[in-house]
Interface confidence: low
């Protein structure tokens, strides 16, 4: 079957997100991928969206992330905009209302996004072949 247009949009957004670091991509988020053996794909997407929503809700106005220079400010605002887009698309792909995120493990946002990108690319390669 053909790949969902949402999946293509997610990969495109993840590519943009992982291209440049900001002051806050080194901050930690819940690592939902650490122990996801008994988790369905939809649950994984839902939980990833939840983690991203928690991150941007908490750090959108964080002055440590906004930085002191105009360039740092632009980059953080762009990061938040991309995270919101990613959150919205992941919810669409998951089709679930809510999902628990209880893991204790942490990972940097940067690593979290790289891992998510790998998963999405794998999914894309399967659905496009």
């Amino acid at each position: 079957h053909k790949c969902d247009i949402t999946l293509q949009e997610i990969i495109k957004t993840l590519n943009s997100l992982t291209e440049q670091k900001t002051l806050c991509t080194e901050l930690t988020v819940t690592d939902i991928f650490a122990a996801s053996k008994n988790t369905t794909e939809k649950e994984t997407f839902c939980r990833a969206a939840t983690v991203l929503r928690q991150f941007y809700s908490h750090h959108e106005k964080d002055t440590r992330c906004l930085g002191a220079t105009a360039q740092q400010f632009h980059r953080h605002k762009q990061l938040i905009r991309f995270l919101k887009r990613l959150d919205r698309n992941l919810w669409g792909l998951a089709g679930l209302n809510s999902c628990p995120v209880k893991e204790a493990n942490q990972s940097t946002l940067e690593n979290f996004l790289e891992r998510l990108k790998t998963i999405m690319r794998e999914k894309y390669s399967k659905c496009s072949s």
């Epitope: 360039q71 632009h74 605002k77 762009q78």
Partner: nanobody, 116 residues
Framework: EVQLLESGGGLVQPGGSLRLSCAAS????????MGWVRQAPGKGLEWVSW????????YYADSVKGRFTISRDNSKNTLYLQMNSLRAEDTAVYYC?????????WGQGTLVTVSS
Amino acid sequence: EVQLLESGGGLVQPGGSLRLSCAASGFTFEEYGMGWVRQAPGKGLEWVSWIPEGGRRTYYADSVKGRFTISRDNSKNTLYLQMNSLRAEDTAVYYCAKNYSPFDYWGQGTLVTVSS
């Protein structure tokens, strides 16, 4: 053609106040986030404050938080920056800017000098 015209700068004593205005034209003002950026003599650009399209949220750099207030009047296509409790380190050229990724249009700037 997009135009941003700042006004309201000048010389003020420490602890004093100023209100900067930015008259915008050439684009649909209410559809864009707007901000203030400043450049102190011999230094790089520093973002000061930001207000999104709807104006419900406002953002401030730590250095001005609690002293500066950004606002906008979409009916007048005008952006404002109320600056209170001014300090010598606030001395800079203040620029009004449109959009944030990156700021794609700038005004000519207005000079604010804080000195006794």
